[in-house]
């Protein structure tokens, strides 16, 4: 728990350099996100493909989309889960991180020092051991997060199933209902290829209790979709006299000394380009 209050931001006096004053874990071990670069990567043949069960959510069901002042969050049902880890990990929520229109490079994890445009996190908790995400969040092996790197490219109708509701959650505390859809559509191609490491929540309280799976391949959203994400939301309540745009809501990469990130793929990426045979 924070030593003193729960106010934190990505900018200004309560920005990430100050997080550890109120949230000691933010200055502690196993912090995320990190830069994924070749000299910390090690292939691990035991990293088998994950199975995504109960991810196809019925449109007859309503799911709560919330502006929590830090991101836009979609609540997920407890019968949605990942199979293939040591325990069952049940979904609790997904949210995104992004940059701003002038610098649209707001992913949390970087690859060889390069940011992607944005990043999706699908948060799960160890439901074999703990009754809910809140209880699990500060426990060993408590959380498992799937991270999807997002780049600018073609229009993505699946991501638009979230983005089309942003106007109803413009301000902190606002909530809207989203029809269920297949959450697996938000994942990239070849989900069997991923990075795996032990890390933390990337927001306060920064608990070092997360098993990270960062998919190797990015998904694409259009420039218009990215711009909508970067311009639609505010960190402040509707009646706040000093509104603050919700931009650059990503944490800087953290030091990652004397540890390894394991990959489910051997690192040679086969390139096929027009004109090459």
């Amino acid at each position: 728990a924070p030593v003193n209050g729960s106010k934190w931001t990505y900018f200004g006096p309560d920005g990430e350099n100050s997080w550890s004053k109120k949230y000691p874990s933010c200055g502690g071990l196993l912090q995320s996100p990190i830069d994924l670069h070749s000299d910390i990567l090690q292939y691990d043949a035991s990293l088998t493909p994950l199975e995504f069960q109960g991810y196809n959510l019925s449109a007859n069901k309503q799911f709560l989309l919330t502006n929590n002042g830090h991101s836009v969050k979609l609540n997920l049902p407890s019968d949605m889960h990942i199979q293939g880890l040591q325990s069952r990990y049940s979904a609790t929520q997904l949210h995104l991180h992004w940059g701003n229109p002038n610098d649209p490079h707001g992913s949390e994890h970087t690859v060889s020092g390069q940011h992607f445009a944005a990043e999706l996190h699908i948060v799960h908790y160890n439901s074999d051991l703990y009754p809910d995400a809140s209880t699990a969040s500060n426990k060993s092996e408590g959380l498992a997060v799937l991270a999807v790197l997002i780049e600018m490219g073609s229009f993505n109708p699946s991501y638009d199933k979230i983005f089309s509701h942003l106007q109803h959650v413009k301000y902190k505390g606002q909530e809207a209902f989203v029809p269920g859809f297949n959450i697996e559509e938000l994942l990239p191609e070849r989900t069997a290829e991923y990075y795996r490491y032990r890390g933390s929540l990337t927001t306060p309280p920064c608990n070092p209790t997360v098993l990270w799976t960062v998919f190797r391949n990015p998904v694409q959203i259009s420039q218009e979709q990215l711009l909508a994400l970067e311009t639609a939301l505010y960190c402040t309540h509707m009646d706040d006299p000093s509104p603050r745009e919700m931009i650059n809501n990503f944490r800087q990469v953290q030091k990652f000394d004397e540890r390894l990130v394991y990959t489910s793929f051997s690192q040679v990426q086969v390139c096929t380009a027009a004109g090459l045979s």
Partner: antibody, heavy 121, light 106 residues
């Protein structure tokens, strides 16, 4: 025929609690959420909360958070609304209802007949 | 919360009259739904998705609007139309209903 039937209403003392039932039939029970909506005498409709019968996940109107608890018994195709610390203003007809998705939105296509709860000493 | 204000709260009209009920939302909503309720009965779905008539609803009913202003119109009032009509939005949590418009016989 799709049906929702509420029961459990009656006279309750102020400060007391109620437990209402909503029995569903005629459709695949876990495919739709069940909502509770109430209507005070001569007043409008007010949403209390809902439950996903497939997993028991609940969402409440903030106004009722902490005082209302919705639960489900899948084996009986029945949802329950428990409300505590009742006051006179909780006197209402309580309905359960089922929303259906139609292309781009939901609407309540099936309603129960309602059950009257009177809070009075 | 999105407040839904219906006007008028009640109206008296004669059979054959054209009747318009307005629902104004305090913030923009995507769709509006309408329910009909008769005394001692549960509400019935009447118009959904702003303009779609529910099963069995006569074609003299219509719905329209966008943003914050929506209307339910009865082109020629019939005896069976005397009831209370409620609008409802599902765009924001909590979902909210209007306070109702009671259509009475003049």
């Amino acid at each position: 025929e799709v049906q929702l039937v509420e029961s459990g209403g009656g006279l309750v003392q102020p400060g007391g609690s109620l437990r209402l039932s909503c029995a569903a039939s005629g459709y695949s029970y876990t495919d739709y959420n069940i909502y509770w909506v109430r209507q005070a005498p001569g007043k409008g409709l007010e949403w209390v909360g809902y439950i996903d019968p497939a997993n028991g996940d609940t969402t409440y109107n903030q106004k009722f958070k902490g005082r209302a608890t919705i639960s489900v018994d899948k084996s009986k195709n029945t949802a329950y609304l428990q409300m505590n610390s009742l006051r006179a203003e909780d006197t209402a007809v309580y309905y359960c209802s089922r929303p259906i998705y139609y292309g781009a939105y939901w609407y309540f296509d099936v309603w129960g007949q309602g059950t009257l709860v009177t809070v009075s000493s | 919360d999105i407040q839904m204000t219906q006007s008028p709260s009640s109206l008296s009209a004669s059979v054959g009259d054209r009747v318009t009920i307005t629902c104004r939302a305090s913030s923009s909503v995507t769709y509006m739904h309408w329910y009909q309720q008769k005394p001692g009965k549960a509400p019935k779905p009447w118009i959904y998705g702003t303009s779609m008539l529910a099963s069995g609803v006569p074609s003299r009913f219509s719905g329209s609007g966008s943003g914050t202003d929506f209307t339910l119109t009865i082109s020629s009032l019939q005896p069976e139309d005397f009831a209370t009509y409620y609008c409802q939005q599902w765009s924001s949590n909590p979902l909210t209903f209007g306070q109702g418009t009671k259509v009475e016989i003049k």
